[in-house]
């Protein structure tokens, strides 16, 4: 999906109002220094591409985050503010949800969510630079 035509301001507002709180809740008990940020992004569409990938694509050691509250809210936000996102992405991510067996917050998942927080911060920063 090409995130170029999204309403970035509205995505930022949703992130600051609600998604960020759920990401921080997920990370509770860990320190920001516990993980190194290895994933980066260069502009707003690129940041959303990376956020989409880390949130919804299963990885070997973190099966899927798609059922978490922050993921459901991310999906809703992208569906609302990125025209055409629902048609191209929702069915694909629905299938991934079925892969998740039990709700175990592994260290690898915590690391992945730490990367997500970094990507979202980067998304906000690139937004501020543009204004």
């Amino acid at each position: 999906y090409d995130f170029t035509n999204c309403d970035f301001q509205k995505i930022e507002a949703d992130y600051l109002r609600t998604i960020s709180k759920d990401l921080i809740t997920y990370m509770s008990g860990t320190k920001s220094t516990d993980f190194n940020n290895t994933v980066s992004c260069s502009n707003r569409p690129h940041c959303l591409t990376e956020i989409q990938s880390l949130t919804f694509n299963p990885t070997p050691r973190c099966a899927s985050l798609a059922k978490e509250m922050f993921a459901r809210k991310t999906k809703a936000t992208l569906a609302l503010w990125c025209p055409g996102y629902s048609e191209t992405q929702i069915n694909a991510t629905q299938a991934m949800k079925k892969a998740r067996k039990s709700k175990v917050t592994t260290n690898k998942c915590l690391e992945q969510v730490s990367q997500l927080l970094g990507l979202w911060r980067r998304f906000i920063r690139t937004l501020l630079k543009k204004q």
Partner: antibody, heavy 120, light 111 residues
Framework: QVQLVQSGAEVKKPGSSVKVSCKAS????????INWVRQAPGQGLEWLGV????????IYAEKFQGRVTITADTSTSTAYMELSSLRSEDTAVYYC?????????????WGQGTLVTVSS | QSALTQPPSASGSPGQSVTISCTGT?????????VSWYQQHPGKAPKLMIY???KRSSGVPDRFSGSKSGNTASLTVSGLQAEDEADYYC???????????FGGGTKLTVL
């Protein structure tokens, strides 16, 4: 069963406000959009706005901006539509309609409608 | 004045086909594949018939079909039946600010 149940008919004076409720049951309320659509007697359908409780987003039709407020209480699975500064032209049946999950612009479930009459 | 334009009326005899048009702009119908159609019988709430231009809602007979060309969407009802007599409304997504636009409605009469 899966349904939307709206509050009863209202008679209001011009200049006053009305608040219509829409109680959802049988589905995960927060994940869907709750839209409000009205129909004046003998007229077509008109979209007022939508709320997506999951992310707390509301979008209003430009025509009603500043006059309509849509809210939701996830603890009771109830959405509300308040319309202020009522005039006779606001006399209509007001419907709440569920917007499909992540496809909030398709209304796949409707309430029974609430008749709001504005008369002095 | 509705943002999407529909003919006020359409008619056909039982067994015939009838097509209802819905004309918008490149900012709504032409810009997105997010057209839907609703059927409304007198005194009843509307019912979703077609979404995403041409997908039938569950329980809707395959006599109902949708299509789109440029800025115009169409609903075709083939093999008309008496119970198809109703008002039909098109809607289109119209961007993140306007969100949804309705057509003015078409009264379908089965002769």
């Amino acid at each position: 069963q899966v349904q939307l149940v709206q509050s009863g008919a209202e008679v209001k004076k011009p200049g006053s406000s009305v608040k219509v409720s829409c109680k959802a049951s049988g589905f995960t309320f927060g994940s869907y959009g709750i839209n409000w659509v009205r129909q004046a007697p003998g007229q077509g359908l008109e979209w007022l706005g939508v709320i997506v409780p999951l992310v707390g987003v509301t979008i209003y039709a430009e025509k009603f901006q500043g006059r309509v407020t849509i809210t939701a209480d996830t603890s009771t699975s109830t959405a509300y539509m308040e319309l202020s500064s009522l005039r006779s032209e606001d006399t209509a049946v007001y419907y709440c309609a569920r917007g499909q999950e992540y496809f909030y612009w398709y209304f796949d479930l409707w309430g029974q409608g609430t008749l709001v009459t504005v008369s002095s | 004045q509705s943002a999407l334009t529909q003919p006020p009326s359409a008619s056909g005899s039982p067994g015939q086909s009838v097509t209802i048009s819905c004309t918008g702009t490149s900012s709504d119908i032409g810009g997105y594949n997010r057209v839907s159609w609703y059927q409304q019988h007198p005194g009843k709430a509307p019912k979703l018939m077609i979404y995403e231009v041409n997908k039938r809602s569950s329980g809707v007979p395959d006599r109902f079909s949708g299509s789109k060309s440029g800025n115009t969407a169409s609903l075709t009802v083939s093999g008309l039946q008496a119970e198809d007599e109703a008002d039909y409304y098109c809607t289109s997504y119209a961007g993140t600010d306007t969100f949804v636009l309705f057509g003015g409605g078409t009264k379908l009469t089965v002769l």
